[in-house]
């Protein structure tokens, strides 16, 4: 999972916060000498060696290709850039740079279906053929359709009532007019 490659390289968050609070903002406690505060590395760089004494420079190096740091830090190595997942139909919105991670997203007329905070699938928005759009497709939500008379909602698409089998939920939505119009997007089908 991104971010990756930093486990064990820096103190745990609780320890880090305690130690950081001993120094003014933008500085951190020297890894071997608690009485020295060193300047943190700028975003886009990582820590090579602590400052030898107060007022002397911390040695930082720019992140190599394929890695980044997005904020001031004292990481011993940069974080690995995220790769947009083609198998989830993701596209690259902006490439990884030394100071910012890759931004992945979806093509136009697609929404994001989340698996975890860092993993999502891009899914085509329902076009609502044979119906009208009740709620448009949003970043993380498919279109909500309202089907025309003679159609019912299944798999987020308006399907002809001739496809409705007896005893199915769609029977209610496929009654003869004037009730044919009354379709509820929450009654049947797939999101």
């Amino acid at each position: 999972i991104h971010p990756s490659g930093v486990t064990g390289l820096v103190p745990s968050l609780g320890d880090r916060e305690k130690r950081d609070s001993l120094c003014p903002q933008g500085k951190y406690v020297h890894s071997k000498n608690n009485s020295i505060c060193c300047t943190k590395c700028h975003k886009g760089t990582y820590l090579v060696s602590d400052c030898p004494s107060p007022g002397r420079d911390t040695v930082c190096r720019e992140c190599e290709k394929g890695t980044f740091t997005a904020s001031q830090n004292y990481l011993r190595q940069c974080l690995s850039c995220k790769t947009c997942r083609k198998e989830m139909s993701q596209v690259e919105i902006s490439p990884c740079q030394a100071d910012k991670d890759t931004v992945c997203g979806c093509k136009e007329n697609q929404f994001q279906r989340y698996l975890s905070e860092t993993h999502f699938q891009c899914v085509d928005c329902s076009p609502c053929f044979n119906g009208t759009v009740t709620i448009p497709c949003k970043e993380t939500q498919n279109t909500v359709c309202n089907c025309h008379a003679g159609f019912f909602l299944r798999e987020s698409e308006c399907v002809p009532c001739s496809h409705c089998k007896k005893n199915e939920e769609c029977m209610k939505l496929c009654l003869p007019p004037p009730l044919a119009n009354v379709t509820n997007p929450q009654d049947s089908g797939t999101a």
């Epitope: 905070e117 939500q141 498919n142 999101a191």
Partner: antibody, heavy 115, light 113 residues
Amino acid sequence: EVQLVESGGGLVQTGKSLELSCEASGFTFSNYDMNWVRQAPGKGLEWVAYISSGSGHIYYGDAVKGRFTISRDNAKNLLFLQMNNLKSEDTAMYYCSGSYWFAYWGQGTLVTVSL
Amino acid sequence: DIVMSQSPSSLAVSAGEKVTIGCKSSQSLLNNKDQKNYLNWYQQKPGQSPKLLIFFASTRHIGVPDRFMGSGSGTDFTLTINSVQNEDLADYYCLQTYSFPYTFGAGTKLEIK
């Protein structure tokens, strides 16, 4: 850390109602589709209900359709299951599960429907 | 409704052996739009909640050991556990999310000899 915590289960008589809640934390709740799944004692898993991230799409299992209502409050990171006209066969452990792929699960809350 | 038939209902193997669990659906789970099979596999250890192992029939979820492998397409799917470990003692379920109502298989109880 992702957490889903179900509550509201307990012993209830046939024909009565009960509302289950699921509190989510550690992830962006409003981005995720959510589900309720149940498991009768010693039995397998049964899907109960689904709600999309923005509540625009809602679906139910055949066994609960017309009796159960799924809803969510994205501002409070809460998922609900309103269960009416309970039957003895609704006795089960009820789990809330997050993501379209059921990637996150709570520990469950036990609902016992007595005659 | 799509019916999911899982087999066997139980099996007992020794640690280190290979395990194969089958799942058949009453209709194809292959989505023609994205060419993905909407079939997931879950593991439920005794007294615990289920855990996602595999989605899209063959994609391992984050953190799942690579001894767990999913395969198959259309209506026939397989979960393979290569070199079973003692901690793999659990019930295993397949689930179709191709269409509503979603349906689980009846489960396979894996016991370690």
